[in-house]
């Protein structure tokens, strides 16, 4: 007589988590009498999947009535598939006994279950940089199968080059992760700036998930300063004004210092928006220039979103003119009270 | 092709936990049993245990009470551990794969580690 | 627990001769599915052991056709058709049905 064999025809199947796979199997005999029990893996520590005699499995069905007389087919449906599910499946023949013994295994169905990838999350640096440092932001997403993909990285719909990713384990595993960390160079117009981690799959169908970031969580734009005076109507003031250009973010505190000695601090207040995105602001003062003796420096010091002070110096300019003005009863402080404009 | 390389202390205190790492390179843990053998000083090979990539271990009866091996997917690396030493625990250690394919026994031990000498000494 | 004994425990040989090694298990390795789990290892000095042979006959990746083996249910031979200096070593046999997997105390092989 023919000796049994036991056919399971694919090598492999494929199903996308969450939908149902059917694994084939198929004896040539029905001698000699006794089970057929599928397992997940060989070996002692295989998982039994399904055992037509006991057991509870809720989400495996045979395709055929195994009870059915003269049944040759035991292939089997498993329902609701997840990336756990995935593995080598052996359709195993027993002959009837106490215990059962093996006789005869298929040559075993390897499971793979495509599983999307889950929202790229991309992440900045912890501190902010200054234009033309280099910062780096990482791309994270998980609980993909298969291992292949591709990740891209975009700034401003730029694509970038400069960037490292690892897709783990290395080895086979129900389901992967990938981690991408690019490199960006700062400049000072990127305020407005987004770097863009586009992830593509095979469970997407052509349509990538992407990640983004925001550039203003990243940069610090100093500020540049210019301090200058201007005369007023009344002849013994002038106007000394301190332009705070180009900085980002909001966050500042000016401080006006008369020879050295601090007069007021400001916090920035209304402050005028650029297209860039940054920041310009101005305070000024009026000065009283009859209570002006042997010159008088007025320095204009900024600390900008807590970083190290950066200040500007101005020698008060007096003309002949002004000090003819002023009688020699003149006195009172050399600031008058200012207001931002 | 697949490499393994163990990892730890080479000299453990007697009483103490003799702990070993093993890293799997150029190949995937899924579906090989990952296996610990020891040899002490000019003897035979004594098998420890093993664990199979869905997490079931099996033990060597007589180290049982004193055996883990664990296994990490995402680093490819398993472990063990090994409390209460004494110098008898004295040995080479190796990490090692074993094959499986369709039944219930196993397919040969067929890439091993190079081996960690590990020394129970106060 | 299966034991495994082999003989002879030190064998010497001459290159170009043959050589065979006995292996003997406590119980059957021949399993009802028709396969042996049965399996020989070379551990050259200084080295890891090798696989050479497994499931009682079959040459493992790479190992050279010198080497046989065979045998069913509870006595097994590992052949070697014409030692080579490289040969030399311990040869153990190991069964690989039942945990705990259990191994021969080896038997040495060295050029007379």
């Known amino acids: 007589e023919e000796e049994l064999q036991v056919i399971q025809p694919e090598k492999s199947v494929s199903v996308t988590a969450g939908e149902s796979a059917t694994l084939n199997c198929t004896v040539t005999s029905l001698i000699p009498v006794g089970p057929i029990q599928w397992f997940r893996g060989a070996g002692p520590g295989r998982e039994l999947i399904y055992n037509l005699k006991e057991g509870h499995f809720p989400r495996v069905t045979t395709v055929l009535d195994p009870t059915k007389r003269n049944n040759m087919d035991f292939s089997i449906h498993i329902s609701n598939i997840t990336p756990a599910d995935a593995g080598t499946y052996y359709c195993v023949k027993f002959r009837k006994g106490s215990p059962d013994v093996e006789l005869k295994s298929g040559a075993g169905t390897e499971l793979s279950v495509r599983a999307k990838p889950s929202a790229p999350v991309v992440s900045g640096p912890t501190a902010r940089a200054t234009p033309e440092h280099t910062v780096s932001f990482t791309c994270e997403s998980h609980g993909f199968s298969p291992r292949d993909i591709t990740l891209k990285w975009f700034k401003n719909g730029n694509e970038l080059s400069d960037f490292q990713t690892n897709v783990d384990p290395a080895g086979k595993s129900v389901s992967y992760s990938i981690r991408s960390t690019a490199r960006v160079v700062l400049t000072r117009r990127d305020v407005h700036s987004q770097v863009i981690c586009e992830v593509a799959h095979v469970t997407l169908q052509g349509d990538p998930l992407r990640g983004t970031a925001n550039l203003s969580e990243a940069i610090r734009v100093p500020p540049t300063l210019e301090v200058f005076q201007r005369p007023m109507r009344a002849e013994n003031q002038v106007n000394v004004t301190c332009q705070v250009r180009k900085f980002y973010p909001q966050r500042l505190l000016l401080t006006w210092l008369e020879n050295g000695n601090v007069s007021q601090t400001e916090t920035a207040s209304t402050l005028t928006e650029n297209k860039d995105g940054t920041y310009n602001w101005r305070s000024w003062l009026l000065v009283n220039t009859c209570a002006h003796r042997d010159g008088v420096v007025l320095t204009c010091q900024v600390e900008h979103d807590g970083q190290p002070a950066v200040s500007k110096s101005h020698a008060l300019e007096v003309s002949a003119h002004q000090k003819e003005q002023c009688s020699d009863t003149t006195s009172g402080p050399v600031l008058a009270p200012t207001a931002p404009l | 092709q697949v490499q393994l390389q163990e990892s730890g202390p080479g000299l453990v205190k007697p009483s103490e936990t003799l702990s070993l790492t093993c890293t799997v390179s150029g190949g995937s843990i899924r579906d090989y049993y990952w296996s610990w053998i020891r040899q002490p000083p000019g003897k035979g090979l004594e098998w420890i245990g093993f664990i199979y990539y869905n997490g079931r271990t099996f033990y060597q009866s007589s180290l049982k009470s004193r055996v883990t091996i664990s296994l990490d997917t995402s680093k490819n690396q398993f472990s063990l551990k090994m409390t209460s030493v004494t110098a008898a625990d004295t040995a080479v250690y190796y990490c090692?794969?074993?094959?499986?394919?369709?039944?219930?026994?196993?397919?040969?031990?067929?890439?091993w580690g190079q081996g960690t000498t590990v020394t129970v000494s106060s | 627990d299966i034991v495994m004994t082999q003989s002879p425990l030190s064998l010497p040989v001459t290159p170009g001769e043959p050589a065979s090694i006995s292996c003997r298990s406590s119980q059957s390795l021949l399993y009802s599915t028709g396969y042996t789990y049965l399996d020989w290892y070379l551990q050259r000095p200084g080295q890891s052991p090798q696989l050479l042979i497994y499931?009682?006959?079959s040459r493992a990746s790479g190992v050279p056709d010198r080497f046989s083996g065979s045998g069913s249910g509870t006595d097994f031979t590992l052949k070697i058709s014409r030692v080579e200096a490289e040969d030399v070593g311990v040869f153990y046999c190991g069964q690989a049905l039942q945990t705990p997997l259990t191994f021969g105390q080896g038997t040495k092989v060295e050029i007379k």
């Open positions: 499931g009682g006959s």
């Open positions: 090692a794969r074993v094959r499986a394919y369709s039944g219930i026994g196993l397919d040969g031990t067929d890439v």
